[in-house]
């Protein structure tokens, strides 16, 4: 069972990404990840989280925003935004620490 080692009861989440096996998944929490790769439009992925809850606490940057929630289908209608573009002298702060 691929979700056996998750903390606590499992929740059902909306799954919308190229790697989803169906419209929903089950995990320890629900996720929304907004990612903008260089030269591309931002893409929003919805799914399940089982590892590295610390990602949920990371600050949004101009490249990525992570959102997590803990109830049934709680990630279904969430829309995220990225931070405003940083000055060119600054590096993107993707390190969540």
């Amino acid at each position: 069972d691929p979700v056996k080692p998750s903390r606590g009861p499992l929740v059902t989440c909306t799954c919308e990404s190229p790697h989803c096996k169906g419209p929903t998944c089950r995990g320890a929490w629900c996720t929304v990840v907004l990612v903008r790769e260089e030269g591309r439009h931002p893409q929003e992925h919805r799914g399940c989280g089982n590892l590295h809850r610390e990602l949920c606490r990371g600050r949004p940057t101009e490249f990525v925003n992570h959102y997590c929630c803990d109830s049934h289908l709680c990630n279904h209608n969430v829309s995220l935004v990225l931070e405003a573009t940083q000055p060119p002298s600054e590096q993107p702060g993707t390190d969540g620490q």
Partner: antibody, heavy 118, light 108 residues
Framework: QVQLQESGPGLVKPSQTLSLTCTVS??????????WNWIRQHPGKGLEWIGY???????YYNPSLKSRVTISVDTSKNQFSLKLSSVTAADTAVYYC??????????WGQGTLVTVSS | EIVLTQSPGTLSLSPGERATLSCRAS???????LAWYQQKPGQAPRLLIY???SRATGIPDRFSGSGSGTDFTLTISRLEPEDFAVYYC?????????FGQGTRLEIK
């Protein structure tokens, strides 16, 4: 079958930057189920976790190395990379990349020895 | 930061005997994310056990894991010649990822 392969120089001069790349085959680095890690092992010693990157580009690093480490991902090439700056002889080690899932570090590269010497 | 301490440092046993390796955490941890690895000289570590007690794909059933809270155990019920190696426990799945210092299992 998922495979990971480390590549990069085997010899780095002191004070320079160590750069390694891990190429993933047989699976997508963009899957949200996985986290992509670097680990090292000094000669005759135990395993030391360096840090991980998620497909989104978010990173977490070992606090003892954080000031010198950068991990990046290139999803288009299915690769992730390690840079370790200001190296000294103490950074001589075998460097491994590994995939992390709910089932632990289930796939590892074979490891590459990096020697820091002038 | 949680520290994992493995004991003994070296374990000397003969083929056919039972091996019991210990991993103790400095504070209580989730048993969902405790793994064991085997490493032989010149090779990468190999995943044996994840989630404290689940065997990884292809791992013989003579390997078993147990424990909770702060105390975890890897048991090899009947040692085969190929089992003599170094074994590491690990906490994964949350920051920071940590490894124990290893137990060397050697032939007596």
């Amino acid at each position: 079958q998922v495979q990971l392969q480390e590549s990069g120089p085997g010899l780095v001069k002191p004070s320079q930057t160590l750069s390694l790349t891990c190429t993933v085959s047989g699976g997508s680095i963009s899957s949200g189920e996985y986290y992509w890690n670097w680990i090292r092992q000094h000669p005759g010693k135990g395993l030391e976790w360096i840090g991980y990157i998620y497909y989104s580009g978010s990173t977490y690093y070992n606090p003892s190395l954080k000031s010198r480490v950068t991990i990046s991902v290139d999803t288009s090439k299915n690769q992730f990379s390690l840079k370790l700056s200001s190296v000294t002889a103490a950074d001589t080690a075998v460097y491994y990349c590994a995939r992390e899932s709910v089932a632990g570090f289930d796939y590892w590269g074979q490891g590459t020895l990096v020697t820091v010497s002038s | 930061e949680i520290v994992l301490t493995q004991s003994p440092g070296t374990l000397s046993l003969s083929p056919g005997e039972r091996a019991t390796l210990s991993c103790r955490a400095s504070q209580s941890v989730s048993s969902s994310y405790l793994a064991w690895y085997q490493q032989k000289p010149g090779q990468a570590p190999r995943l044996l056990i994840y989630g404290t007690s689940s065997r990884a794909t292809g791992i013989p059933d003579r390997f078993s894991g147990s424990g909770s809270g702060t105390d975890f155990t890897l048991t090899i019920s009947r040692l085969e010649p190929e089992d003599f190696a170094v074994y590491y426990c690990q906490l994964y799945g949350s920051f920071p990822i940590t490894f124990g210092q290893g137990t060397r299992l050697e032939i007596k």
